[in-house]
Amino acid sequence: AVNGTSRFTCFYNSRANISCVWSQDGALQDTSCQVHAWPDRRRWNQTCELLPVSQASWACNLILGTPDSQKLTAVDIVTLRVMCREGVRWRMMAIQDFKPFENLRLMAPISLQVVHVETHRCNISWKISQASHYFERHLEFEARTLSPGHTWEEAPLMTLKQKQEWICLETLTPDTQYEFQVRVKPLQGEFTTWSPWSQPLAFRTKPAALGKD
């Protein structure tokens, strides 16, 4: 066998994108590799060029259609292959039978905005992006708030165990700058994982009212 270890991981965004990462120890950075997608019950097939993202890791996106088109369902199986060029021929490196709705990772939530802010509270809303209508309300969210002098890793996670696209942050400090992020995960799928974190939303609480003399 080829020496070292390799890893091939793909996720479906629930609409029209399968994102894949291929890594192999000892593989040359300029190796030319592709991912080929062959659905079992669709007339299309798709290929993407793996591009380096780190020392021994490559990634690409299989674009299956327009961003909000529903290209796959829970009964689909897509056979995914990693093929790398060796001289004049292509060599198979990995094959996976991929069930899209068992391997979900949604796009990061978008359109974060402050609905209302007070001295100690802030109400924030967001939207999910390119998420399948199949989920109906079967989604959950995690959120975190960055306080001054702390890192994102130190921020406690707040869990919303339902499809709730808003949150009311409480016990905040007046006249203080904060940042807020949220991510989403469908309840479905054995290998489903959290979306990336949203872009941070910066906000400032209102100053406390001056006390009367």
Epitope: A1, G4, T5, D40, T79, M92, A94, I95, Q96
Partner: nanobody
Framework: EVQLVESGGGLVQAGDSLRISCAAS????????MGWFRQAPGKETEFVAG????????HYADSVKGRFTISRDNAKNTMHLQMNNLKPEDTALYYC??????????????WGQGTQVTVAS
Amino acid sequence: EVQLVESGGGLVQAGDSLRISCAASGRIFSNYAMGWFRQAPGKETEFVAGITHLTSTTHYADSVKGRFTISRDNAKNTMHLQMNNLKPEDTALYYCAADRNIKITADWSYWGQGTQVTVAS
């Protein structure tokens, strides 16, 4: 507990056929690709053949293509490797392996103990 158990190995003459098998626990068999690797004395472990769990897509090493056939019996949680026109260079310890992917690297998640195949000239 994950268990992969190979059987069917033995001593044969060059040009003969042999079928080796691998029995797997149910959860592994229904959710993982299965494959065969082999290791000859003093040599590195070599990918032989693999088969995916849903579409039964197969892949073979160039050295066995056209001579070996991998198959799986989902009803019995068993995988087989039919080896025809065996050659002395096919002599090795044959391992069954399971992983989410067929990979040509020998870092699959689960492994059996191996069954010895010896081809005499």
